[in-house]
Interface confidence: medium
């Protein structure tokens, strides 16, 4: 995250780290005992599930046991829209046990359209700056706002590739964005309760004024969430 | 049309074993976790049991635990449930239900009645 | 286990009326609550699930609000065959549980 401060895990209790051969490759966030909700790119590389870890409760990197994943499920890849369908969900092989920093986020609901400038949190273990530099050993939050898609998508921006299925998230003068590591973590809305209305995916560069950070917007994909748990118990 | 049809209930002894099924028609059977629901006379609803579109993960209720067994023949779009060591509190319509949307039960039988008394 | 708590266990109302029932509980559910009408002699049927959307199919007088702990299920200008018995339950974790249930009468 770029432009951040510290953050605890008391704050953010579903945030979780995705580890490949224990390095931590995207962040996620629990859904519920059994589920994790993560971007889809995450795992272009590995789709098996033996060498994947999830790390909870913890808001450093290296802290806190890892739990064994049970499935991976990715929905199908869109080739005319490569960018769209970046969303994924982790299944893990026991259940969480909740507590003060082990806890799930809400989906959002089906209509929950939020308005240019609706505050939003952003938190990740990536990169604080958009050219390189590390990880970051604990967890950072911001504070940003929804971009207008019109904005998003104009000539200085991203040229009409942020389809309805994404939203767009920063501030107006840039600054504050996701980064390289931070993909696959949850973009918060606080209603009556934590809703996560998108999952961090792509964007040019990190914290730039006209291209700010894009999400997957979940709403668009709660039909495919609840097709994959009809299946499943 | 989409449904599920139960049949096996009836009378029994307790301590006896009863085998209920459930067939299913009208939609693609093994997209979906089935259930097992229960509503004993006057009483309220209960899960009983549960079974993931592959049998891969299966959940009893407390209540029957360790005496009833959920199964599924996906070929034959049909769910079992082997009910042993049976109970007069274990008397009940008994109904199949399939899990959909947000894990509901969108698709209900019509019910089975099991009656445990001497 | 997650317990699941309905108030009020029974309502008698007119026709037209406004009418809600709670359920809460016993820990956090994010938002995996679903409300089911019963009529005597027939099996449930399912009215809302993820504690806001609609099932195909059901009147929209029928609503749902509600996260975490406490949902609700309202039903606005409440017409004769609304008559049964209402459960809410949760599909949150296993093993699923059900409300006692809101028995409800038309006057």
């Known amino acids: 995250v770029v432009g951040v401060e510290e953050a605890s895990v008391d704050s953010w209790p579903w945030q979780v780290s995705i580890q490949y051969d224990k390095q931590h490759v995207c962040g996620g966030s629990i859904l519920d005992p059994h589920w994790v909700l993560t971007a889809a790119h995450c795992f272009r590389k590995h789709t098996d599930v033996f060498n994947w870890k999830v790390r909870a409760g913890s808001d450093k990197l290296g802290s806190f046991p890892s739990l064994a994943v049970a499935k991976i499920i990715i929905i199908e890849f869109n080739p005319m829209y490569p960018k769209d369908n970046d969303i994924a969900l982790m299944k893990l092989q026991f259940p969480l046990t909740f507590s003060g920093t082990v806890r799930p986020i809400c989906l959002p609901f089906f209509d929950e359209e939020l308005t240019p400038a609706t505050p939003l949190w952003i938190i990740g273990w990536g990169f604080t700056k958009q050219n390189g530099g590390k990880m970051s050993d604990i967890l950072l939050q911001a504070s940003v706002q929804v971009i207008d898609s019109t904005r998003c998508n104009a000539d200085d921006a991203y040229q009409g590739e942020v389809t309805e299925k994404m939203m767009c998230a920063g501030i107006p003068e840039g600054g504050v964005d996701t980064c390289q590591g931070d993909s696959g973590g949850p973009l918060m809305y606080q209603s009556d309760q934590w809703h996560v209305v998108g999952i961090v995916s792509w964007g040019y560069g990190c914290g730039g004024p006209s291209t700010p950070g894009v999400y997957t917007k979940v709403s668009a994909y709660l039909n495919w969430i609840y097709n994959v748990w009809k299946a499943e118990l | 049309q989409m449904q599920l049809v139960e049949s096996g209930g009836g009378l029994v002894q307790p301590g006896r074993s009863l085998r209920l099924s459930c067939a299913a028609s009208?939609?693609?059977?093994?997209?979906?976790?089935i259930h097992w629901v229960r509503q004993a006379p006057g009483k309220g609803l209960e899960w009983v049991s549960g079974i993931s579109w592959n049998s891969e993960i299966v959940g009893y209720g407390d209540s029957v635990k360790g005496r009833f067994t959920i199964s599924r023949d996906n070929a034959k779009n049909s769910l079992d449930l082997q009910m042993n060591s049976l109970r007069a509190e274990d008397t009940a319509v008994y109904y199949c239900a399939r899990g959909s949307s947000g894990r509901a039960f969108d698709i209900w039988g019509q019910g089975t009645m099991v009656t445990v008394s001497s | 286990d997650i317990q699941m708590t309905q108030s009020p266990s029974s309502v008698s109302a007119s026709v037209g009326d406004r009418i809600t029932i709670t359920c809460r509980a016993s820990q956090s559910i994010s938002t995996y609550l679903n409300w089911y009408q019963q009529k005597p002699g027939k099996a449930p049927k399912l009215l809302i699930y993820g504690a806001t959307s609609l099932q195909s199919g059901v009147p929209s007088r029928f609503s749902g609000s509600g996260s975490g702990t406490d949902f609700t299920l309202t039903i606005r200008g409440l017409q004769p065959d609304d008559f049964g018995t209402y459960y809410c339950q949760q599909s949150y974790n296993l093993p699923r549980t059900f409300g006692q249930g809101t028995k409800l009468d038309i006057k």
């Open positions: 009208g939609f693609t059977f093994d997209d979906y976790a």
